[in-house]
């Protein structure tokens, strides 16, 4: 089952102390089978395991990617897995870890001289022959911080948001990804109704900012479902 | 400072319903994913529900699948989750988590850094 694949991972994404925030002082941390940590006057314990379902890559760590986490398994479950070490199987860019990217399967490190030459190529090559762009799966194709000592402006080429400068986030622009502001109140954005669908965007938007969340325009109520207009709105 | 608050939460029996809410307030972050964990008494907690940012991802325990719908509503800042054919075994504390994140911030690997303090769920036979 899903539930036993996900307890078989490594610890992660401990829980604070009740009402706290992650990183508090204090936590402790004890070997599975639990986490050991303070809860009230006394310490508890919880699972080793907290599955983190997602949609996109963005929404994991940069050290994850988004994907189902087994073959046929749960439909439509997405959660973030821990990506992937050089020389292991990938099918994109994300699967890999930073300093990595994914060549002819494999994730091979990012060497500065050979990688850019190439990064137009694998894009391309992902967007137009990879199977994964069109299963449900997202792509986060991602530059190593290796690769540009500056984060990139607006308009730069990126393959992660990370790569990106503050306000900034990595989306598609036809065949490859570049540097795009975060939208800001009053903005359209992009509701993904149907899983997977971001995968199709040449014309890729950013998510909200801060504070913001993509909903109905409030005078689109009424219209049909498929002109329905999406802005950034105050939570 | 960040609040999590949980209710909904009581006595009810075996076969039953209830409707646990959890609304975070204070703090300017965006909320990305947001979950249900439980403890019941001398046992480790569990996630019992958790949803992704946009909705479309949503994950359910085994023992709670087709029975407990988590949901969310994000202009509200509140996560719902609808808890149905009640058992004995479902009884215990019942906790909301939730990622919050700054502006721009990513952190190396995802989890749920906001905790409410719970509601008890009492299921009798």
């Known amino acids: 089952t899903l539930n036993s694949v996900l307890n078989s991972n490594a610890i992660k994404n401990l829980p604070p102390p009740l009402g706290g925030a992650a990183g508090h002082p204090g936590s402790a941390v004890s070997a599975a089978p639990g986490i050991l940590y303070p809860g009230g006057n006394k310490y508890q314990t919880i699972d080793n395991y907290q599955p983190y379902p997602c949609a996109e890559d963005e929404e994991c760590g940069t050290d994850e990617y988004c994907a189902s986490p087994t073959r046929g398994g749960d439909a439509g479950v997405q959660i973030c897995l821990a990506c992937r070490k050089r020389r292991k199987r990938c099918m994109r860019h994300a699967m890999c870890c930073p300093g990595n990217y994914c060549k002819n399967g494999i994730c091979v490190s990012s060497d500065q001289n050979h990688f850019r030459g190439e990064i137009e190529e694998t894009i391309t090559e992902s967007f137009g022959n990879d199977h994964s762009t069109l299963d449900g799966y997202s792509r986060r194709t991602t530059l190593s911080s290796k690769m540009y000592h500056t984060k990139g402006q607006e308009g730069s080429v990126c393959l992660r948001s990370s790569d990106c400068a503050s306000g900034l986030c990595c989306a598609r622009h036809f065949w490859s990804k570049i540097c795009k502001p975060v939208l800001k109140e009053g903005q359209v954005c992009t509701k993904h109704r149907r899983k997977g669908s971001h995968g199709l965007e040449i014309f890729q938007r950013c998510y909200c900012g801060e504070g913001l969340s993509c909903r109905i325009q409030k005078d689109h109520h009424q219209a049909s479902n498929s002109s329905r207009l999406h802005t950034c709105q105050r939570h | 400072e960040v609040q999590l608050v949980e209710s909904g939460g009581g006595l009810v029996q075996a076969g039953g319903s209830l409707r646990l809410s959890c609304v975070v307030s204070?703090?300017?972050?965006?909320?990305?994913?947001m979950g249900w964990f439980r403890q019941a008494p001398g046992k480790l907690r569990e996630i019992v529900a958790a949803?992704?940012?946009?909705?479309?991802?949503?994950y359910y325990a085994d023992s709670v699948k087709g029975r407990f719908t988590i949901s969310r509503d994000d202009a509200k800042k509140t996560v719902y989750l609808q808890m149905n054919g009640l058992k004995s075994e479902d009884t215990a504390v019942y906790y909301c988590?939730?990622?919050?994140?700054?502006?721009?911030?990513?952190?190396?690997?995802?989890?749920?850094?906001?905790w409410g303090q719970g509601t008890q769920v009492t299921v009798s036979s």
């Open positions: 988590a939730v990622d919050g994140r700054a502006n721009g911030e990513r952190p190396a690997v995802a989890g749920y850094n906001y």
């Open positions: 204070g703090g300017t972050f965006s909320v990305y994913a």
């Open positions: 949803i992704s940012r946009t909705g479309s991802s949503i």
